[in-house]
């Protein structure tokens, strides 16, 4: 507990102090006081530097004194032989004696009293920034007019903080400007503009005079600008050392003016204004900005339009342009959007054709469609080459975005038929010689495939069975072979409107307009054993002349069998119609004169007994195309005959091309259109 005074005596005082003793006293007086310690008696063994016995006075870490020997007062009016004055309120006294004393020493007597200290004058460091006032046991600081004492109760400063400037234009100066600014002050000014405006500070060099930096370059008084995480300054010296125009890129600016105790100058004056926040003119590849300006500021809106072949992809939606707004933070909205090359995507597949997997599907890439040759060709031209266009579509120079269409090649057998002598008088044939040949099992008959969806046959074949089962692709017609071939399912049968339907078809004598079309449910896949025959053209080139040769094929009656198991074929010449009229009907169902002969019929045969017969009906009479010798067209359809092995009558297909085309067009699926 601190005391105001006290007495300290060496051990056994006034008797001789013992050897080998060490004793210490901790003196403490109240805060705000110093200590006056004085000795009235001192008798301690003398030694050099008081090495043997001593009394030591310590203040903090400092040894104030070390005493030994005998002392007497110099002043007859005062008993004090030694004294110490410390401005601190704590002191330590330590007495030490060694192992022997040559004489008898009595030690010491000392007293301490608390003394007032003058904090205003007694210390090197002045405790108050301005006025210091001492009193017994303490001191207090005070300030000149217009200054106030800070919370530390030592420093005075001016009340220059707390101002908030919100106007878009203004002027700020240091306190008392242009008179010297207050020392020991921290002035903070806040500029707060609405979002979207940046604070721009302008100064003139001559409007700035602040205490210069020390030798290390540190400002003693300083002016600092803080905008978010950016700092400008500190600035000091005579004449403004920084940029005279500071664009802060922020709508909030803090101005901090810090001064020390010395060296006041006239200070500073600045102007500020709010600029709409600028947004950088960014380099956005593959695009153009509208409007084009040298500088863009807050609330400016630009339309960024992608160059041809580029698009902006947001989610799953592709667009060719987007809008971007200069925002209050100086950044563009939609800045993540970029003009990327248009991606046309994986090209659509096409029926009966293919497209190689493209290396790239981006703008400018090229792909090539091909048809499954030699069975299909590209009907709608264009060469099959498509490039990825700017609108994201695969585009062909001729067709535009329309896909190529692979349609069956007609009239080209994979293997040409080599005539052999055995149909009637015909030869064995392979389905590859007549890939258009269709087999009808009920009634046992034939037909000709003319495209993916249509079979041409004789009307008398389908008049009694409107849901015929048909097969393609097989040379032989045993059940097991047909099971391995392609069965065709009819969707609808179209009999020529000129064909007269009879209640008793067996007694028919009029085979005029003996033609029908069968629409298939599903398209036929073409290949070496299945391929259509061409239709005749409408020009006079397709008018048959006597002696023109044609091929017939079928599984009809032969010399040895009622029905052939393996496909038979023969080459026959066209004959004058009268040749057919002259042949006696084998098993007439009516008077010979009742049989009708019309220009819709072709007469053929009569050579080497080669002829079609029962079971061959509906099959094609195939003639070489006069304009393309590699192709065959269906000039006729096996219709009827007076007698097998002589002449036969065939429906003249050329006369029905318009009806065939019209029927097919009116009954095509949308996919075919």
């Amino acid at each position: 507990e601190p005391t105001m005074y006290g007495e300290i005596l060496s051990p056994n005082y006034p008797q001789a102090y013992p050897s080998e003793v060490e004793k210490s006293w901790d003196i403490e007086v109240p805060e705000g006081y110093g200590i006056h310690l004085y000795f009235t008696h001192l008798d301690i063994e003398l030694s050099e530097n008081c090495a043997y016995d001593s009394v030591q006075i310590i203040s903090g870490d400092t040894e104030e004194g070390r005493l030994c020997g005998q002392r007497s007062s110099n002043n007859p009016h005062s008993p004090i032989v030694e004294e110490f004055q410390v401005p601190y309120n704590k002191l330590q006294v330590i007495f030490k004696s060694d192992f022997s004393n040559e004489e008898r020493f009595t030690g010491f007597a000392a007293y301490y009293v608390a003394t007032d200290i003058n904090e205003c004058t007694d210390f090197v460091d002045v405790p108050c920034s301005h006025f210091c006032n001492n009193f017994i046991g303490g001191y207090f600081c005070s300030c000149p007019p217009e200054y106030f004492l800070h919370d530390d109760m030592k420093n005075c400063g001016v009340n220059c903080s707390g101002d908030v400037f919100t106007a878009l234009i203004g002027e700020i100066a240091s306190p008392n400007y242009p008179k010297p600014y207050p020392e020991n002050s921290r002035c903070e000014y806040q500029i707060r503009l609405e979002k979207g405006f940046q604070v721009v500070v302008t100064l003139r060099r001559e409007d700035f005079d602040v205490e210069a930096a020390d030798s290390a370059g540190n400002c003693l008084d300083s002016l600092v600008f803080v905008a978010g995480d950016r700092q400008f300054g500190p600035y000091c010296g005579h004449g403004f050392p920084g940029p005279l125009n500071i664009e802060t890129k922020s709508n909030a600016l803090d101005i901090i003016f810090q001064t020390d105790l010395t060296g006041q100058k006239k200070g500073w004056k600045l102007r500020y204004h709010g600029d709409p926040m600028p947004c950088p003119k960014e380099d956005t590849p593959n695009s153009v900005w509208e409007p084009a300006k040298a500088k863009y500021v807050f609330r400016d809106v630009v339309q960024i339009t992608c160059l041809d072949g580029f698009e902006v992809v947001e989610g799953r939606v592709g667009a060719t342009s987007f809008y971007s707004t200069c925002q209050s933070n100086g950044k563009w909205s939609n800045s993540k959007l970029k003009c990327q090359p248009v991606d046309c995507g994986i090209p659509e597949s096409i029926e009966n054709g293919k497209v190689e997997d493209p290396e790239s599907t981006l703008f400018g890439s090229v792909i090539r469609y091909t048809c499954e040759e030699p069975y299909y060709y590209m009907e709608n031209g264009g060469g099959g080459e498509y490039h990825c266009a700017g609108n994201g579509s695969w585009v062909n120079e001729v067709l535009g975005p329309e896909l190529p269409k692979c349609v069956p090649v007609c009239g080209v057998p994979r293997e040409p038929f080599e005539e052999k002598q055995r149909i009637i008088g015909g030869s064995d044939a392979d389905i590859k010689n007549f890939p258009w040949q269709v087999f009808f099992d009920n009634p046992w008959a034939g037909g000709a495939l003319i495209n993916e969806y249509w079979v041409l046959t004789a009307a008398h074949v389908v008049e009694g069975n409107r849901e015929p089962t048909m097969y393609v692709g097989s040379t032989s017609v045993q059940t097991s072979r047909l099971a391995k071939s392609k069965m065709l399912t009819p969707e609808h049968v179209f009999i020529h409107p000129g064909w007269k339907l009879l209640e008793v078809p067996e007694g028919r004598t009029n085979f005029d307009n003996d033609i029908a079309l069968v629409r298939l449910k599903d398209p036929v896949k073409m290949g070496p054993t299945v391929s259509p025959i061409c239709l005749p053209g409408t020009s006079s080139d397709y008018n048959l002349m006597d002696g023109d040769l044609g091929l017939i094929s079928g599984w009809g009656r032969t010399e040895k069998r009622d029905r052939a198991v393996r496909l038979k074929a023969a080459r026959l010449p066209v004959a004058p119609l009268r040749k057919c009229k002259e042949v006696k009907v084998e098993k007439p169902t009516a008077d010979a004169e009742a049989y009708v002969f019309t220009p819709n019929m072709i007469c053929a045969g009569g050579e080497k007994g080669m002829d079609s017969c029962k079971g061959d009906s509906g099959g094609a009479f195939a003639v070489q195309d006069p304009n393309d010798k590699t192709k065959f067209y269906a000039a006729g359809l096996v219709s009827w005959g007076p007698q097998c092995g002589t002449y036969g009558l065939y429906t003249r297909v050329k006369n029905y091309v318009d009806w065939i085309m019209k029927t097919m067009q009116e009954n095509s699926t949308p996919r075919e259109d």
Epitope: E415, E418, K420, Q421, R422, S427, D428, D430, K432, T475, Q478, T479, S480, R481, T558, K560, R561, A564, V565, R566, K568
Partner: antibody, heavy 118, light 107 residues
Framework: QVQLVESGGGLVKPGGSLRLSCAAS????????MSWIRQAPGKGLEWVSY????????YYADSVKGRFTISRDNAKNSLYLQMNSLRAEDTAVYYC???????????WGQGTLVTVSS | DIQMTQSPSSLSASVGDRVTITCQAS??????LNWYQQKPGKAPKLLIY???NLETGVPSRFSGSGSGTDFTFTISSLQPEDIATYYC?????????FGGGTKVEIK
């Protein structure tokens, strides 16, 4: 008159190869489908292979598939049977036959004996 | 594969006798059946096609019938020159298969 003459038979070790030939005369060879039929000693007939007129279509019995190859040369009026990887069970008289029409063999050769033995 | 079962495997009959051989297919073969005659040491000879049609030049004492799976070959009056082995053959599907044969002898 129609004649079919087989040749090329003989003794061969298992795993060996032989090529049989059939020379046709007296008819237009290219008009007809042709077949090979074999008959093991004291056994019945076994159809081996068949070829179409142009040679584009061929069929084989399961027992010879992958080992035997039928071919024809219409210009030379000849039918062939290349036999590889022969086994003891391939020992037989091999006949070539003309397929008159619809799988009926109307003309046959006299046959050639193939013996597979070590 | 279609199996052809022929019976009997052999028979002995007198000259002038009616001889009947049967052939059964393991599945329906319609009328796609031939009958062949093979005399000892000779190549086979076609007698019947399409189950019932007589090949040109074949004596009329030979006949065939049947459809589907069951077929019959008949020699109406056995002659000494008819001594041979008779085979049926199906051509409904590949592989073409023969019956095991019926050996006909004269008593």
């Amino acid at each position: 008159q129609v004649q079919l003459v087989e040749s090329g038979g003989g003794l061969v070790k298992p795993g060996g190869s032989l090529r049989l030939s059939c020379a046709a005369s007296g008819f237009t060879f290219s008009d007809y489908y042709m077949s090979w039929i074999r008959q093991a000693p004291g056994k019945g007939l076994e159809w081996v292979s068949y070829i179409s007129r142009s040679g584009s279509t061929k069929y084989y019995a399961d027992s010879v598939k992958g080992r035997f190859t039928i071919s024809r040369d219409n210009a030379k009026n000849s039918l062939y049977l290349q036999m590889n990887s022969l086994r003891a069970e391939d020992t037989a008289v091999y006949y070539c036959a003309r397929d008159e029409t619809d799988y009926a063999f109307d003309e046959w050769g006299q046959g050639t004996l193939v013996t597979v033995s070590s | 594969d279609i199996q052809m079962t022929q019976s009997p495997s052999s028979l002995s009959a007198s000259v002038g006798d009616r001889v009947t051989i049967t052939c059964q297919a393991s599945q329906d073969i319609s009328n796609y059946l031939n009958w062949y005659q093979q005399k000892p040491g000779k190549a086979p000879k076609l007698l019947i096609y399409d189950a019932s049609n007589l090949e040109t030049g074949v004596p009329s004492r030979f006949s065939g019938s049947g459809s589907g799976t069951d077929f019959t070959f008949t020699i109406s009056s056995l002659q000494p020159e008819d001594i041979a082995t008779y085979y049926c053959k199906q051509y409904e599907d590949y592989p073409l298969t023969f019956g095991g044969g019926t050996k006909v002898e004269i008593k």
